[in-house]
């Protein structure tokens, strides 16, 4: 009978704790309520991962995590009668999941992916040290907008690195970018240990280069106008404008955080266009401009990947050497 048990009494442990993997890297633990829990107890479940990380107290009898399964991961679960973290939960029950078997030295290394211009993802990796040179690799990927796991078809080599690219287009007006792409690389023969990675869609984004539309002089200032890469709004980008002067052989680099086209000298209302005024430029000399962009922390987690440089554009006259 469960009569007058005090809520502070330690509850029995949860039962039937099990673990499974969905997609490529979604690990799900489920359990049943404890047997013989006191009737006046509103059950809550305390759980944390093996290293005491991500403590959680919730009423659900499941917990999931998106994690690259390159290492063993364990969840400990206990039951309690309140949301109070200081309440001692029941005996904790633990369930672990191990990565697929295989020689760790056979697994690929440096598995990383870059989302190019929010239109396709390019992943690359190095072969494991303990693998045969004729190993054939396969990359699998999954994200929320896919119904099932897909196999990447376009395997290529760049030097010692292997790679594969697949279409991944930003979906407008959705929480698409708040999610991640799950990646796994293994070999066709099943001889190597699979490698996993999770790529958050707010990081590792490399924009296409911008396109310079117009250069013009006003007094001793150089006005630069360019078109940003498709799929990006200008406030989400950070710019680097490089100006080389042929006569003085100077090389000036300007880091531009905001590039609004508010000056009357700039062509107005051109969609997705940015502008910058370079001060103190000699109009009677040849000036060559190029621009590159990268994502900023306003919209993205990562701000390390510069685009390639734009095509150069020049303005002014090349002086004759006397």
């Amino acid at each position: 009978g469960g009569g007058g048990a005090a809520p502070t009494e330690t509850q029995p442990p949860v039962t039937n704790l099990s673990v499974s993997v969905e997609n490529l890297c979604t690990v799900i633990w489920t359990w049943n309520p404890p047997e013989g829990a006191s009737s006046n107890c509103s059950l809550w479940y305390f759980s944390h991962f093996g290293d005491k990380q991500d403590k959680k107290i919730a009423p659900e009898t499941r917990r999931s995590i998106e994690v690259p399964l390159n290492e063993r991961i364990c969840l400990q679960v206990g039951s309690q009668c309140s949301t109070n973290e200081s309440e001692k939960p029941s005996i904790l029950v633990e369930k672990c999941i191990s990565p697929p078997e295989g020689d760790p030295e056979s697994a690929v290394t440096e598995l990383q992916c870059i989302w190019h211009n929010l239109s396709y993802m390019k992943c690359s990796w190095l072969p494991g040290r303990n693998t045969s040179p004729d190993t054939n690799y396969t990359l699998y990927y999954w994200h929320r907008s896919l119904e099932k796991i897909h196999q990447c078809e376009n395997i290529f080599r760049e030097g010692q690195y292997f790679g594969c690219s697949f279409d991944l287009t930003k979906v407008k007006d959705s929480s698409f970018e708040q999610h991640s792409v799950q990646i796994m690389v293994k070999d066709n023969a099943g001889k190597i240990k699979p490698s996993f990675n999770i790529v958050p869609l707010t990081s590792r984004v490399k924009p296409d280069p911008p396109h310079i539309k117009n250069l013009s002089f006003h007094n001793d200032d150089l006005y630069v106008q360019w078109e940003n890469p498709q799929n990006f709004i200008s406030r989400c980008l950070f710019y680097e404008v490089e100006v080389n002067n042929s006569q003085t052989e100077t090389h000036n680099v300007f880091y531009v955080q905001e590039a609004k086209c508010e000056n009357p000298e700039f062509e107005r209302n051109v969609e997705n266009t940015s502008c910058f005024m370079v001060p103190g430029v000699l109009p009677d000399t040849l000036n060559t401009v190029r621009i590159r962009v990268k994502t900023n922390k306003l919209c993205y987690e990562d701000d390390k990947l510069w685009s390639n440089w734009s095509q150069e554009m020049s303005i002014g006259k090349k002086r004759n050497s006397t």
């Epitope: 040290r129 303990n130 690195y161």
Partner: antibody, heavy 118, light 107 residues
Framework: EVQVLESGGGLVQPGGSLRLSCAAS????????MTWVRQAPGKGLEWVST????????YYADSVKGRFTISRDNSKNTVYLQMNSLRAEDTAVYYC???????????WGRGTLVTVSS | EIVLTQSPDFQSVTPKEKVTITCRAS??????LHWYQQKPDQSPKLLIK???QSFSGVPSRFSGSGSGTDFTLTINSLEAEDAAAYYC?????????FGQGTKLEIK
């Protein structure tokens, strides 16, 4: 033409330091691991250290672990070997080599001589 | 660590002769074995990759064979310019290891 060229060797006292450089040209530097191999006078070849193309994976021979540091600057197409706490047994010609494929060395530099002596 | 043992350590041969150098690994390394040639006062040069694949630009008289633990470098019809030290190298796992070398002298 694919080339690698070492520099920075010389005479150093035991316990001293030296930094070797290896400048590469003629290939996409960041796509290839670079390796240092040494050869003591009149002896065979000994692998010293390797750094992967992007610099994320670094490996050392037990004989130099904790004393030598390999690094690379992909913007300069250069790999470095910082050698600290040098010993007499580190005396050797140090070769820089470009790795290819499944870990073989297809291009070697001419080598730079490091002499550790008091 | 995988130990490579070459034999012979030294060989004196006459031009046009066929030369065989062997390399034995302390454990199976598949085809992850490569052969290098080092002429006096020069840096090593790749001859054979993956046990049997000739590297580009290497004369056809050089060939390699074997897999697992036993490997062979063969020089058919030796030429005077082949006087050098020859090294086998294992690249399966780390550390990379070299054989002790075989010095080839032309009579």
């Amino acid at each position: 033409e694919v080339q690698v060229l070492e520099s920075g060797g010389g005479l150093v006292q035991p316990g001293g330091s030296l930094r070797l450089s290896c400048a590469a040209s003629g290939f996409t530097f960041s796509n290839y691991a670079m390796t240092w191999v040494r050869q003591a006078p009149g002896k065979g070849l000994e692998w010293v250290s390797t750094i992967s193309g992007r610099g994320y994976s670094i490996y050392y021979a037990d004989s130099v672990k904790g004393r030598f540091t390999i690094s690379r600057d992909n913007s300069k197409n250069t790999v470095y070997l910082q050698m600290n706490s040098l010993r007499a047994e580190d005396t050797a010609v140090y070769y820089c080599a470009k790795e290819e494929g499944h870990w073989y060395f297809d291009v070697w530099g001419r080598g730079t001589l490091v002499t550790v002596s008091s | 660590e995988i130990v490579l043992t070459q034999s012979p350590d030294f060989q004196s041969v006459t031009p046009k002769e066929k030369v065989t150098i062997t390399c034995r690994a302390s454990q199976s390394i598949g085809s992850s074995l490569h052969w290098y040639q080092q002429k006096p006062d020069q840096s090593p040069k790749l001859l054979i990759k993956y046990a049997s694949q000739s590297f580009s630009g290497v004369p056809s008289r050089f060939s390699g064979s074997g897999s697992g633990t036993d490997f062979t470098l063969t020089i058919n019809s030796l030429e005077a310019e082949d006087a050098a030290a020859y090294y086998c190298m294992n690249s399966l796992g780390l550390p990379y290891t070299f054989g002790q070398g075989t010095k080839l002298e032309i009579k």
